[in-house]
């Protein structure tokens, strides 16, 4: 990927998903009535014409927003601190690497628009999640719904990263 995002970035993303799964505190079966349409911007991760700058920007903003969401007093009160610390550490490592990559990609002349546009869209999406948590008074079920939503959106974003990596491999081998 541009700065050749290494295999361990994909591994870190999968570890983040594993941690989010382990963080589960209550049965989701208790929370069906709390479901909400957060309107994840699927078009941002589903396209076939993937630019390096776009992919990195989406991943960076996703991870930044997840880090912020799970780095609050409310979050500390809701989740197991050991798992939360591991999540923070993993996210921080991924963010550092992505920031290096983004600088390199911008240096290579890819458009700044490809970077700023997904960031704004994702900020709106995460703002909706924050509003929901506040509306639901940060209940256990609200956090459970959010945890599963974050897992879904991170899974889709990670898939986008894998698609770009395999596209790069195909180009390299042809």
């Amino acid at each position: 990927l541009g700065c050749d995002l290494p295999q361990n970035h994909g591994l870190l993303s999968r570890n983040t998903l594993v941690l989010l799964h382990q963080m589960r505190r209550i049965s989701p079966f208790l929370c069906l009535k709390d479901r909400r349409d957060f309107r994840f911007p699927q078009e941002m991760v589903k396209g076939s014409q993937l630019q390096k700058a776009h992919v990195m920007s989406v991943l960076h903003e996703m991870l930044q927003q997840i880090f912020s969401l799970f780095h609050t007093e409310r979050s500390s009160a809701a989740w197991n601190m050991t798992l939360l610390d591991q999540l923070h550490t993993g996210l921080h490592q991924q963010l550092q690497h992505l920031e290096t990559c983004l600088l390199q990609v911008v240096g290579e002349g890819e458009s700044a628009g490809a970077i700023s546009s997904p960031a704004l869209t994702l900020r709106r999406y995460f703002q909706g999640i924050r509003v929901y948590l506040k509306e639901k008074k940060y209940s256990d079920c609200a956090w459970e719904v959010v945890r599963m939503e974050i897992m879904k959106s991170l899974f889709l974003s990670t898939n986008m990263q894998e698609r770009l990596r395999s596209k790069d491999r195909d180009l390299g081998s042809s």
Epitope: H21, R24, S27, P28, F29, C31, L32, K33, D34, R35, R36, D37, F38, E144, V145, M148, E149, M151, K152, F155
Partner: antibody
Amino acid sequence: EVQLVQSGAEVKKPGESLKISCKGSGYSFTSYWIGWVRQMPGKGLEWMGIIDPSDSDTAYSPSFQGQVTISADKSISTAYLQWSSLKASDTAMYYCARHPGLNWAPDFDYWGQGTLVTVSS
Amino acid sequence: DIQMTQSPSSLSASVGDRVTITCRASQSIGSALNWYQQKPGKAPKLLIYFASSLQSGVPSRFSGSGSGTDFTLTISSLQPEDFATYYCQQSYDFPLTFGQGTKVEIK
């Protein structure tokens, strides 16, 4: 292509045990729950229970609690429905269907083809 | 448990007719209501989810409306392939429950 493929029809005697299966493919099996639905001959649909294959957490309809066991093996993307002692009244078509869990997405959007279970002496 | 009551239990209609099936929940379920079509010997097929969202691949002659306790499935112009049994199902809370079904027959 998303598919749920169920095991074949079964003919059993009262008191026998049985385990039927539902294999998912074409999607991330652990990202969706699997529900089971019964349809007795000429009757309507009855929800039996559901499983989260990611950790095998289950929920049952009170009508079926203790009568059946739902399980899953995520390593082979398969969910199961089992009986330890069948009764003639268990004769029915059994369907599995996938559910998006707490995500805002269509419920039971894909169904298995059904497994006909006949219990007769 | 949330009880789901469908009406009518059966109806006869002709090709081209506008058909309406209603479903009532015993308590408010917001918009957590799905509609399925089932043909003899086949698995049910999802038509409408969250009361009014048309499932991908389902013809636009099918539509759903309602919220709270009262819901409606409408077929704007009945086609030969629409003769089947229709079920509503609440997905608001466990245990999930279905209506008893409405059989749409040829007049």
